[in-house]
Interface confidence: low
């Protein structure tokens, strides 16, 4: 699986998890957000060769296209595959305000 | 929607679903379909600015940081959304057979 | 880094063969596709053809039949076989990856980087 | 098979001043885009300026730039330096040919 375990240990070109911290103040402009400060979010990038953890028959079809076809500008691309949440605090006014965003956190990728 | 009724009738620069005909036997060397000779597969291609059909909360999330920091490699793909199956026509041996494909042609497309 | 080196070349007999290597590291064949190019002194650059990261070969039409385009990804090697060697293809060799444009395979752009430093192979008697 | 035209053969001018040179193509390069410019200097390899016909590589200084479609091509320079004193080449990439690569002759920029 092209997942954190296996990517973050290997230097793989190819499709794969990527490790990015994002500082929700800086990078973000998000000055709501009390705790964390910031967060692995996380992406997906690589190039997608033909069969490498295809979603669909199509992103299959089109990874042999791309492969029979280098000049063409029709490929799969490297997108999340597992996201999970992440648990934020922030304050309405003055009381504090505990929730769960959904789809944060990238752990897998997949060429679709 | 990112779909064909909509991309193909406008000169959309951003990400939308581009209409690819693939010919089985010159594109994919499959000699074994005996019908159709060919298809529209169809694409996603395009930037994906922030907001734009964000898939999740980690692609706006990412298409912001991205905004904010044109120079980071970590960016929303165009990737399929809504695909639909294909019928083909192969032989085994001289006996005819009929077989869906599931996920075969692209009809709208998503910022993942 | 990411590195081409080229080898292989020298002084060979008209209708006399050569293998060139092309040494690629800091990158995997399996992901990029490798061109070679030659220059003949003093004159343009002119495209021979590649290998894609698939293993599909394509070439130029006048090098189509003489030259032929192979790779070792274990090795970390692209190759030239030239067969027929002719003093016209006295010239400089360059192999180049296709510069990765975007997070997949979108093409190339045309964008030929980076290069080697070249190998030079002279056809004469 | 694509044939480039690069015009003027050779462009004497000197320092400060700006340098246009053309490339014409025999055919639609792909996407329309499909256009690089190289730099080369005696004794060197090829260095990439530009691809994708506008898109400045990095670390390329903006006095450099790339426009055109289609088949009409043009690189500028808008105040040359002593290190610009070079030959330049454009390659396109094509689709559907058989030479999926071509080079222009180039255009030697000389000290005036």
């Known amino acids: 699986a092209l997942d954190t375990n296996y990517c973050f240990r290997n230097l793989e070109e190819n499709c794969c998890v990527r490790p990015l911290y994002i500082d929700f103040r800086q990078d973000l402009g998000w000055k709501w957000v009390h705790e964390p400060k910031g967060y692995y979010a996380n992406f997906c990038s690589g190039p997608c060769p033909y069969l490498r953890s295809a979603d669909t028959t199509h992103s299959t079809v089109l990874g042999l296209y791309n492969t029979l076809n280098p000049e063409a500008s029709a490929s799969p691309c490297c997108v999340p595959q597992d996201l999970e949440p992440l648990t934020i605090l922030y304050y309405v006014g003055r009381t504090p305000k505990v929730e769960q965003l959904s789809n944060m956190v990238v752990k897998s990728c997949k060429c679709s | 929607a990112l779909d064909t009724n909509y991309c193909f009738r406008n000169l959309e620069e951003n990400c939308c679903v581009r209409p690819l005909y693939i010919d089985f036997r010159q594109d994919l060397g499959w000699k074994w379909v005996h019908e159709p000779k060919g298809y529209y597969a169809n694409f996603c291609s395009g930037p994906c600015p922030y907001l734009r059909s964000a898939d999740t909360t980690h692609s706006t999330v990412l298409g912001l940081y991205n905004t904010l920091n044109p120079e980071a490699s970590a960016s929303p793909c165009c990737v399929p959304q809504d695909l639909e199956p294909l019928t083909i026509l192969y032989y085994v041996g001289r006996t005819p057979k009929v077989e869906q494909l599931s996920n075969m042609v692209v009809k709208s497309c998503k910022c993942s | 880094e990411q590195q081409l080196v080229e080898s292989g070349g020298g002084l060979v007999q008209p209708g006399g063969s050569l293998r060139l290597s092309c040494a690629v590291s800091?990158?995997?064949?399996?992901?990029?596709?490798v061109n070679w190019v030659r220059q003949a002194p003093g004159k343009g650059l002119e495209w021979i053809g590649y290998?894609?990261?698939?293993?599909?070969?394509y070439y130029a039409s006048w090098a189509n039949g003489r030259f032929t385009i192979s790779k070792d990804s274990a090795k970390n090697s692209v190759y030239l076989q030239m067969n027929s060697l002719r003093a016209e293809d006295t010239a400089v060799y360059f192999c180049?990856?296709?510069?990765?444009?975007?997070?997949?395979?979108?093409?190339?752009?045309?964008?030929?980087?980076?290069w080697g430093p070249g190998t030079l192979v002279t056809v004469s008697s | 098979e694509a044939v480039l035209t690069q015009s003027p053969g050779t462009l004497s001018l000197s320092p400060g001043e700006r340098a246009t040179l053309s490339c014409q193509s025999s055919?639609?390069?792909?996407?329309?885009?499909?256009l690089s410019w190289f730099q080369q200097k005696p004794g060197q390899p090829p260095r990439l300026l530009i691809y994708?016909?506008?898109t400045l590589t990095s670390g390329v200084p903006d006095r450099f730039s790339g426009s055109g479609s289609g088949t009409d091509f043009t690189l500028t320079i808008s105040r040359l330096e002593p290190e610009d004193f070079a030959v330049y080449y454009c390659?396109?990439?094509?689709?559907?040919?058989?030479?999926?690569?071509?080079f222009g002759g180039g255009t030697k920029v000389e000290i005036k």
């Open positions: 994708g016909a506008s």
């Open positions: 800091g990158f995997s064949l399996s992901s990029y596709t």
């Open positions: 290998i894609s990261y698939g293993g599909s070969a």
């Open positions: 390659a396109g990439g094509y689709s559907g040919s058989s030479d999926k690569y071509a």
């Open positions: 055919q639609s390069v792909y996407n329309n885009n499909y």
């Open positions: 180049a990856r296709h510069m990765q444009v975007g997070g997949a395979p979108t093409g190339s752009m045309a964008a030929f980087d980076p």
